[in-house]
């Protein structure tokens, strides 16, 4: 699986997941979230070579399409599969509140 | 929607649905595929700018990174959202079979 | 420049609905916390409601709760407010305005504000 | 809901004199929880002061803000033409924000 425990060991220069560290207030403008003060979300990227983890019938056949016609400008793109939430702490005023906010991790990646 | 209605008709640059004709037999090397001979199997392509059909939250906050950041090398990417089975023909020796190929036509894509 | 330009204010009858639009220019839209304030004629100000761009957390007066919906189109940089089962009391001139950070906070920048007028 | 009452209803002063309005909350907001707008007749509120000191951006150096807990004060040093309207403060210590209903400075 092109997951965090594979891709963050290994030097994969093909689809895999990358770490990527998003500081709230910095990269987003969010002055609102108060912790975390940012989150690895990371992200995916590196080619997709034939049959490279491929997510449905069409991604396996462009794939193959790339490798037979090697010209072509059509081909699968490095993607997130698996995701997971974040749980923020922020404040209404001076009440905190938390929150999961849904699919804000990338944990692994397919070619579609 | 950025489906095969819109795409095709408009000069999209952006992330899209774009039309690509496989031929089983000369694309694929698949000679065993009666009929069709071939099918449109479309492909998803260009760039993905914040917020353009954001798939998950994770899309939508790593093009607002991407924004913010641009000379950051994390961005969505353009890849299928809507698939279609395509309906094929083979013969098993002298008998002829129907199958419907799950997920084999792109008819619009996501920023993911 | 900030800009906050709202439209879809009009006089509508008590029960009706109406759709009030907030279109953002001139800073990153969804950085910022954004909020619906009206103002009865010859009144004074009255916090109606805010949402939080892309996690799309919302919260509401108890006046407009389950009548109102705040909601927001990153990718337009624009905000709504869905106002449902309307009453005459909630006649006013609706503003939207953006907070300086927080989700609760001092509002920098204001619309130039839409008439609501509900009467029969 | 935190109330907050301002004072007085309307002040009647002329040009060059000095203001000072006054914010009272019915329960304690800290020390920056509050803001201070003006309204013109027409117009949308203006952000002067917030986290109850704070100069907004382009406000000139004759509004102040001050005061913590539940009694906050505007002061206008030296009263322009231009400053001749309504005044609201407003909290977000608690849910839901809260205004108060306004002093009017008129001209005398």
């Known amino acids: 699986a092109l997951d965090t425990n594979y891709c963050f060991r290994n030097l994969e220069e093909n689809c895999c997941v990358r770490p990527l560290y998003i500081d709230f207030r910095q990269d987003l403008g969010w002055k609102w979230v108060h912790e975390p003060k940012g989150y690895y979300a990371n992200f995916c990227s590196g080619p997709c070579p034939y049959l490279r983890s491929a997510d449905t019938t069409h991604s396996t056949v462009l794939g193959l399409y790339n490798t037979l016609n090697p010209e072509a400008s059509a081909s699968p793109c490095c993607v997130p599969q698996d995701l997971e939430p974040l749980t923020i702490l922020y404040y209404v005023g001076r009440t905190p509140k938390v929150e999961q906010l849904s699919n804000m991790v990338v944990k692994s990646c397919k070619c579609s | 929607a950025l489906d095969t209605n819109y795409c095709f008709r408009n000069l999209e640059e952006n992330c899209c649905v774009r039309p690509l004709y496989i031929d089983f037999r000369q694309d694929l090397g698949w000679k065993w595929v009666h009929e069709p001979k071939g099918y449109y199997a479309n492909f998803c392509s260009g760039p993905c700018p914040y917020l353009r059909s954001a798939d998950t939250t994770h899309s939508t906050v790593l093009g607002l990174y991407n924004t913010l950041n641009p000379e950051a090398s994390a961005s969505p990417c353009c890849v299928p959202q809507d698939l279609e089975p395509l309906t094929i023909l083979y013969y098993v020796g002298r008998t002829p079979k129907v199958e419907q190929l799950s997920n084999m036509v792109v008819k619009s894509c996501k920023c993911s | 420049d900030v800009q906050l330009v709202e439209s879809g204010g009009d006089l509508v009858k008590p029960g009706g609905s109406l759709r009030l639009t907030c279109v953002a220019s001139g800073y990153t839209f969804s950085s910022n916390v954004m909020h619906w304030v009206r103002q009865a004629p010859g009144k004074g100000l009255q916090w109606v409601a805010y949402v939080i761009p892309i996690v799309d957390i919302a919260y509401y007066a108890d006046s407009v709760k389950g009548r109102f919906t705040i909601s927001i189109d990153n990718s337009k940089n624009t905000l709504y407010l869905q106002m449902n089962s309307l009453k005459t009391e909630d006649t006013a001139t609706y503003y939207c305005?953006?907070?300086?950070?927080?989700?609760?906070?001092?509002?920098?920048?204001w619309g130039q504000g839409t008439l609501v007028t509900v009467s029969s | 809901e935190t109330v907050l009452t301002q004072s007085p209803g309307t002040l009647s002063l002329s040009p060059g004199e000095r203001a000072t309005l006054s914010c009272r909350a019915s329960?304690?907001?800290?020390?920056?929880?509050l803001a201070w707008y003006q309204q013109k007749p027409g117009q949308a509120p203006r952000l002067l002061i917030y986290g109850a000191s704070s100069r907004a951006p382009g406000v000139p150096a004759r509004f102040s803000g001050s005061g913590s807990g539940t009694d906050f004060t505007l002061t206008i040093s030296s009263l322009e033409p231009e400053d001749f309207a309504v005044y609201y403060c407003?909290?977000?210590?608690?849910?839901?924000?809260?205004f108060g209903q306004g002093t009017k400075l008129e001209i005398k």
């Open positions: 329960q304690s907001l800290g020390s920056s929880y």
């Open positions: 305005a953006r907070t300086l950070g927080l989700v609760l906070d001092a509002m920098d920048y």
């Open positions: 407003q909290q977000y210590a608690d849910s839901p924000i809260t």
